[in-house]
């Protein structure tokens, strides 16, 4: 028989976890002993089962872990893992601080939407991934030409709004272009906005003439290039 002991103490060296609000926190207390010990979690010295926590918690006993998603300021506190068997018990304290982030303009993932080359008649998907503290809204714009010009007298580009949507934070927004023609070629912009401001990123769609099926191998419908 053996009292509980930590099997990977080096993984437990980070005692203070300062995490931005909305992030996921994982505490681990990997242990062993004979008989195999059990693990319980306390928050500020009280038994913690997460029943009062929006989103609850995930306890993975085989991984000796506690997982909390989308942390909020009320999750701040001291989290104790209590590992025990018939021979003895050990405990370890983690401190959680939840940092309230400053709401910012939406951040668009670099490289999205991506420049894309497609063949006439194929389908194209343009992707835009938005990170935003406040709920963002998205517009897909196509830059258009009016009277032979891409810009108005004021110097601003002519655009056509193709799609408007409210999305959840960190969701991927997709613009589907079905059965593309040469007229669909051009510059497309993903615009994301929230209460702080707007952010834009653009990509070019190149549309190639239909290839001769007698010599073309089965090619993918669209090719993405950076």
């Amino acid at each position: 028989q053996q009292a509980p002991y930590w099997t990977h103490p080096q993984r437990m060296e980070k005692k203070l976890h300062a995490v931005p609000a909305g992030n996921t926190v994982k505490f681990r207390c990997p242990a062993a002993g004979n008989p195999t010990p059990t693990i319980r979690w306390l928050k500020d010295g009280q038994a913690f089962h997460g029943e009062n926590r929006i989103g609850g918690i995930r306890l993975r006993h085989q991984h000796w872990s506690l997982v909390m998603e989308s942390v909020v300021p009320s999750d701040r506190g001291t989290y104790t893992c209590l590992v025990e068997n018939a021979v003895g018990s050990i405990r370890y304290n983690y401190l959680l601080d939840v940092l309230e982030r400053s709401p910012h303009r939406p951040i668009l993932q670099a490289g999205l939407p991506a420049n894309t080359t497609a063949v006439v008649g194929s389908d194209v998907e343009l992707l835009c991934k938005v990170y935003s503290d406040a709920q963002p809204h998205i517009q897909w714009l196509k830059h258009i030409v009016i009277n032979g010009s891409s810009f108005g007298a004021d110097g601003f580009p002519y655009v056509q709004v193709l799609k408007t949507a409210d999305i959840n934070s960190s969701e991927v927004e997709v613009l589907y272009l079905r059965n593309v023609s040469a007229e669909d070629a051009g510059e497309y912009t993903c615009l994301a906005g929230n209460s702080i401001g707007l952010s834009y990123q653009s990509a070019w769609l190149t549309v190639l003439p239909e290839e001769d099926p007698t010599w073309t191998a089965a090619a993918p419908e669209a090719r993405y290039t950076d």
């Epitope: 400053s102 303009r105 406040a134 655009v159 408007t164 615009l191 929230n194 209460s195 401001g197």
Partner: antibody, heavy 124, light 112 residues
Framework: EVQLLESGGGVVQPGRSLRLSCAAS????????MHWVRQAPGKGLEWVAV????????YYADSVKGRFTISRDNSKNTLSLQMNSLRVEDTAIYYC?????????????????WGQGTMVTVSS | DIVMTQSPDSLAVSLGERATINCKSS???????????VYWYQQKPGQPPKLLIY???NRFSGVPDRFSGSGSGTDFTLTISSLQAEDVAVYYC?????????FGGGTKVEIK
């Protein structure tokens, strides 16, 4: 003409409440976030609060958090600032400012249109 | 919070001469979309601030071309190439990238 007109300012004692209003005209009010910014006499500009176009998101400066509440009535094109537990240091001109629009904008995405301001004096 | 530090506090320039106002932010205002979100305002006594420059270097409509904005990342400059009598005012920089939005302390421009 795009216009913002604040009202509701006045002299009030510390600890009391006041409600400011801002009437918007000349643009689609319900498509824009709106802000309050204040300026103490002879001092610089201080951002106070913002509300999203539909009222679902609100953020405040730490100096007013828990005391001030920003709200809007899109059917009446009005923005409000409910100020409770007023302090002497809240004395300022309060400006209503248009923020980011809900979609593509030609030019700046907000902070382009300011009202004339309304004076709030907190004094015993 | 992002701190905006303006210099100088005041500036006396002869008519027709160049006026240069500096602004420094405590963190980069270059956003992921490639734009730098610093704005410049002019405020005359008894009036609300008026937007001059947005997104670092874009002149707002109706603003004379003697006003220009430049800089990158954390260091920004508003330049009045040839000061006119009507340019006497207080000038403010502002960061418009995250809340709380913050302003510089202001620079008072006078005629020498």
């Amino acid at each position: 003409e795009v216009q913002l007109l604040e009202s509701g300012g006045g002299v009030v004692q510390p600890g009391r409440s006041l409600r400011l209003s801002c009437a918007a005209s000349g643009f689609t009010f319900s498509s824009y976030a709106m802000h309050w910014v204040r300026q103490a006499p002879g001092k610089g500009l201080e951002w106070v609060a913002v509300i999203s176009y539909d009222g679902s998101n609100k953020y405040y400066a730490d100096s007013v958090k828990g005391r001030f509440t920003i709200s809007r009535d899109n059917s009446k094109n009005t923005l409000s600032l409910q100020m409770n537990s007023l302090r002497v240091e809240d004395t300022a001109i309060y400006y209503c400012v248009r923020g980011a629009g809900r979609g593509y904008t030609y030019g700046p995405d907000g902070f382009d249109i300011w009202g004339q301001g309304t004076m709030v004096t907190v004094s015993s | 919070d992002i701190v905006m530090t303006q210099s100088p506090d005041s500036l006396a320039v002869s008519l027709g001469e160049r006026a240069t106002i500096n602004c420094k932010s405590s963190q980069s205002l270059l956003h992921s979309d490639g734009k730098t979100y610093v704005y410049w305002y002019q405020q005359k006594p008894g009036q609300p601030p008026k937007l001059l420059i947005y997104e670092l270097s874009n002149r707002f409509s109706g603003v004379p071309d003697r006003f220009s904005g430049s800089g990158s990342g954390t260091d920004f400059t508003l330049t009045i190439s040839s000061l006119q009598a009507e340019d006497v005012a207080v000038y403010y920089c502002m960061q418009y990238i995250e809340a709380p939005l913050t302003f510089g302390g202001g620079t008072k421009v006078e005629i020498k």
